[in-house]
């Protein structure tokens, strides 16, 4: 997977009046890395690993960048002409990637009230607009504003691309991201299925990086894909990931089955516990909402695009 840096900024307005704050989160390699703390007026690292990336350096540069971007986005929202009454949101997502072959990608996407209306490839400076008439109108509106703003010149977009990559390289240089390995905690549970059958579930949690092999084995041989059910590998909000795999087996044959886990060159096997342990899987499976993003989005049903 490529290394990536992703900026998520959102500003809100009510009856055309744009709020003075903004919401921002930065993800590094898919993990929550920084967020803008409005109360402290600063970019704050998300967890110890994020702090380790910059070591004893301050986050002033990140704060300055996010504040500047937030200000730009507020101005952009203020210039959207079709703002009707009520609550509206403008979200900008900017992503840059460095691939294994050292090639790079950068893009920028704008969403209004959760709907994508404008994308730009920051390398080719090519704009893409979805077909809907609303998106076309919004895109024209925003592009005209960006053109009027002397800052938003060809050089500006090149700089956005270069700055994002420069920051990503700076973070990677610390070695923290590249070296970081958190082994999973593996937990096997069983629950009643139908007559004579039980469902066994193997959960791996709190691991990093996200690449993992988790599979059920019978007598040491991996079960076929179609006899197993896998959960997505999802961020758990703590800078690590979680996933699960389940299968249905005959009661009494538990000792023939093991959960096999492979992660970052290490592997382990985990037997099915004896006894009847009933578990609710739904909570665990769905416990992956907006990676600790401000509750505002949850409360106001503002869509946060991943």
């Amino acid at each position: 997977e490529p290394h990536s840096l992703r900026y998520n900024l959102t500003v809100l307005s009510w009856d055309g009046s744009v709020q003075s704050g903004f919401l921002a989160e930065v993800h590094l390699d898919g993990q929550p890395f920084l967020r803008y703390d409005r109360q402290k007026c600063r970019a704050k690292p998300q967890g110890q690993w994020a702090e380790d990336v910059l070591g004893n350096k301050t986050w002033d540069r990140e704060t300055r960048d996010l504040t500047g971007n937030g200000k730009d986005l507020r101005m952009t929202l203020a210039h959207i002409k079709d703002q009707k009454e009520g609550l509206h949101s403008l979200q900008e997502i900017r992503v840059c990637e460095i691939h294994e072959d050292n090639s790079t990608r950068s893009s920028q996407h704008f969403y209004y009230d959760g709907e994508l209306f404008l994308s730009q490839n920051l390398e080719t400076e090519e704009w893409t607009v979805p077909q809907s008439s609303r998106a076309q109108t919004l895109a024209m509106n925003v592009r005209n504003f960006l053109k009027e703003d002397a800052m938003k010149t060809k050089t500006h977009y090149h700089a956005m691309h270069a700055d994002c990559l420069q920051e990503l390289r700076r973070y990677l240089e610390s070695g923290v991201v590249l070296r970081r390995t958190v082994p999973p905690m593996v937990n096997v549970t069983r629950s009643e299925a139908s007559e004579g059958n039980i469902t066994v579930t193997c959960r791996a949690s709190s691991f990093y990086p996200r690449n993992i092999i988790l599979t059920w084995r019978q007598d040491g041989v991996s079960l076929s894909h179609d006899t197993q059910q896998w959960g997505d590998v999802l961020p758990d909000g703590n800078g690590t990931y979680q996933t699960w795999v389940a299968t249905r087996i005959c009661r009494g044959e538990e000792q023939r089955f093991t959960c096999y886990m492979e992660h970052s060159g290490n592997h382990s096997t985990h037997p099915v516990p004896s006894g009847k342990v009933l578990v609710l899987q739904s909570h665990w499976q769905h416990h992956h909402h907006h990676h600790g993003l401000n509750d505002i989005f949850e409360a106001q049903k503002i869509e946060w695009h991943e």
């Epitope: 009510w14 009046s17 704050g21 703390d37 402290k40 505002i296």
Partner: antibody
């Protein structure tokens, strides 16, 4: 523990300038947060006047913009309020407080009377 | 500017009773609201931020609720030390403004 303490003249004549100082202990004003001035009029109405952020940027209440200035002395960990051309309606208790959105630490306040 | 209205200026409640103090904003403020308690001769003290988040050290009998334009501070099992004036404050956009206050007394 974070502590803020206001100090000032107590009495100012109309049309003069008012200068107040907020001394912060237990926290560096250049670390983070915004550092605010808030006043409370005799009828208990509270008014946010403005702030200076940890980085030195300022934001003022538009109702006071032409008269207000907030500055700081980082070596003394102090920030200041200057209000020009005061009138009797500026009589109030003046508080300094910490926070970029809401105010989690306040000083005890200093009472200022504008009178000739 | 956003105006915060606390319609009830005075409230008289029995000891051990339940109190709700309302705060209405002139615009949608997206839960960006704080509640303060002020006792005579003291500075205001932060109780709740983001409409519902209780500050450290604030008794659990205090709670905040609401959304959009309408917000409420609730106090269950009223104690004598809760006698004070309560203010709401928004931080949707500058200038940040305060409500006019609700003075709470024991019946």
């Amino acid at each position: 523990e974070v502590q803020l303490e206001e100090s000032g003249p107590g009495l100012v004549k109309p049309s003069q300038s008012l200068s107040l100082t907020c001394t912060v202990t237990g926290y560096s004003i250049t670390s983070d947060y915004a550092w605010n001035w808030i006043r409370q009029f005799p009828g208990n109405k509270l008014e946010w006047m403005g702030y200076i952020s940890y980085s030195g940027s300022t934001n003022y209440n538009p109702s006071l913009k032409s008269r207000i200035s907030i500055t700081r002395d980082t070596s003394k960990n102090q920030f200041f309020l200057q209000l020009n051309s005061v009138i009797t309606e500026d009589t109030a208790t003046y508080y300094c407080a910490r926070g970029g959105t809401y105010f989690d630490y306040w000083g005890q306040g200093t009472t200022l009377t504008v009178s000739s | 500017d956003i105006v915060l209205t606390q319609t009830t200026s005075y409230l008289s409640v029995s000891l051990g009773g339940r109190v709700t103090i309302a705060c209405k904003a002139s615009a949608h403020i997206n839960n960006w609201l704080a509640w303060y308690q002020q006792k005579p001769g003291n500075a205001p003290r932060l109780l709740i931020s983001d409409a519902t988040s209780l500050e450290t050290g604030v008794p659990s009998r205090f709670s905040g609720s609401g959304s959009g334009k309408d917000y409420t501070l609730s106090i269950t099992s009223l104690q004598t030390e809760d006698v004070a004036t309560y203010y709401c404050q928004h931080y949707w956009s500058t200038p940040w403004t305060f409500g006019g206050g609700t003075k709470l007394e024991i019946k």
